[in-house]
């Protein structure tokens, strides 16, 4: 096992240079020190080491820093960032936007979405603020990444990001995530009016509380039944017939086609029959 072998005399390097290319894998494992690599990451990136050799270097760094890399090293990772996993990144403590931006440049076009998300999340967790460059770098990543952030991290996402979210980006988000994102979206779109507001907020409605839905009913949104079906059952069942009538507007008749399915069935079950009768749709509670 390579782990057991001792470094041959005279083979212990003082610097990272081309000679290391010719070391056998077990020699790299036995002779190269993690702190040496950490201090000379620029050379590690410059010299054309094989993927296997770089993997050994990563193993050495991981052993040297079992609690996660220090920010001084993270800042210097350069292209070596590609060999770092999201799990590794979650152990880091990144506080500088420069560090984040440096690594985001490295990751550009490299299919490293998971690493980028983990990096931004760890930066946010440390209380970092998203500057324009970071937000721009996130532009290229499908916004489903929002569901990967912890609820705490989500709070740190600027509301401006909400403008970029598409219809199915949040399909995998938990209820808690959606609740936070709905509030962010409300704040992002507060100066948008009428139909445009509803088009924007529609994506986030799975996070709307009962109170939010009641408030939404005050704005002539004419919600279609497909959107209605995505609402939280808990939020929906407490709405009155009048509120649902106002929410759906001209689409109120579509309740009939969905009356046997959740969440419409759950909502009907909670209403008084005389109130349902007032809709004239033949709905049964």
């Amino acid at each position: 096992d390579t782990e057991q072998k001792a470094c041959p005399p005279g083979k212990e390097p003082n610097v990272v240079d081309e000679n290391l290319i010719f070391y056998q894998n077990w020699e790299l494992e036995a002779c190269v020190d993690g702190t040496l690599l950490a201090g000379q990451m620029d050379l590690v990136n410059e010299i054309p080491f094989t993927y296997e050799q770089l993997s050994i270097f990563k193993h050495k760094l991981d052993k040297t820093y079992p609690q996660g890399y220090p920010e001084s090293l993270i800042k210097q990772l350069g292209h070596f960032f590609r060999y770092v996993s999201p799990e590794d990144i979650r152990q880091w403590n990144v506080t500088s936007p420069d560090t984040v931006n440096t690594l985001l440049k490295v990751s550009k076009g490299q299919k490293m979405d998971a690493q980028v998300i983990a990096l931004v999340a760890c930066y946010l967790r440390g209380g970092g603020k998203l500057d324009e460059d970071i937000v721009k770098a996130l532009d290229n990543i499908p916004l489903s990444y929002l569901c990967d952030f912890s609820p705490q991290d989500l709070h740190a996402i600027p509301s401006s990001v909400m403008w970029l979210v598409g219809l199915h980006d949040l399909d995998k988000c938990s209820q808690r995530h959606l609740g936070i994102l709905y509030q962010k979206a409300c704040s992002a779109f507060q100066n948008v009016s009428g139909l445009e507001y509803f088009e924007k907020i529609r994506t986030f409605l799975g996070g709307a509380s009962r109170e939010d839905l009641r408030a939404l009913s005050q704005h002539n949104v004419s919600m279609d039944i497909a959107t209605f079906k995505k609402l939280q059952v808990d939020a929906l069942v407490g709405l009155s017939v009048a509120e649902v009538q106002k929410l759906l507007g001209p689409h109120i008749g579509d309740l009939k086609t969905e009356e046997d399915k959740s969440p419409v069935r759950d909502w009907l079950f909670r209403q008084q029959q005389k109130d349902l009768d007032s809709l004239g749709l033949g709905l049964q509670g």
């Epitope: 939010d212 408030a215 005050q218 407490g238 009048a242 009538q245 106002k246």
Partner: antibody, heavy 117, light 107 residues
Framework: EVQLVESGGGLVQPGGSLRLSCAAS????????MSWVRQAPGKGLEWVAT????????YYPDSVKGRFTISRDNSKNTLYLQMNSLRAEDTAVYYC??????????WGQGTLVTVSS | DIQMTQSPSSLSASVGDRVTITCRAS??????LNWYQQKPGKAPKLLIY???RLHSGVPSRFSGSGSGTDFTLTISSLQPEDFATYYC?????????FGQGTKVEIK
Amino acid sequence: EVQLVESGGGLVQPGGSLRLSCAASGFTFSDYFMSWVRQAPGKGLEWVATISNGGTYTYYPDSVKGRFTISRDNSKNTLYLQMNSLRAEDTAVYYCARFDGYIFDYWGQGTLVTVSS
Amino acid sequence: DIQMTQSPSSLSASVGDRVTITCRASQDISNYLNWYQQKPGKAPKLLIYYTSRLHSGVPSRFSGSGSGTDFTLTISSLQPEDFATYYCQQGNTLPYTFGQGTKVEIK
């Protein structure tokens, strides 16, 4: 039985302030939006303010925006209307009303506010 | 804001008469039209909501119709307790607005 009882009306000078209260009973107060509607002497009805069931959202017409503040205390089943910078044209009977979607379905008996020097 | 115009402003009628009050909205309000009854010195009471639905406890002699901008409240056979002022209110668009009222008096 739904009951709404307003209080706090009275005579106030122009520019002055007044706080109206409305005690609610007979329904789950925290489940409903609530509103204030006023009626000047011998005139029609005018909607003044609405607040969401949890107090997060508030709505006002332009005539009172920035001067009146609607609030609620769900633990006390009470609705409030804080009226500042009062004008002669704010003289009216102020009614507290339960609001359901687009309907003022139950009303209190009203409290008279007179703004005069 | 949506203007609500009621006509007539007042009318005189006898017990047993059929009474019709109209309400016109300055723009389409779909069916979000409610009617209230108010007696002197009392609070308004909801009679009809969503154009034609009777609120609980309201007698069936009251009925409502219309859609869009033109609405009607009909009392099929006027009773002594129906002498009051009637208001329409649109619930389609904020700010919610009321008509100026129609006073139904004894002839």
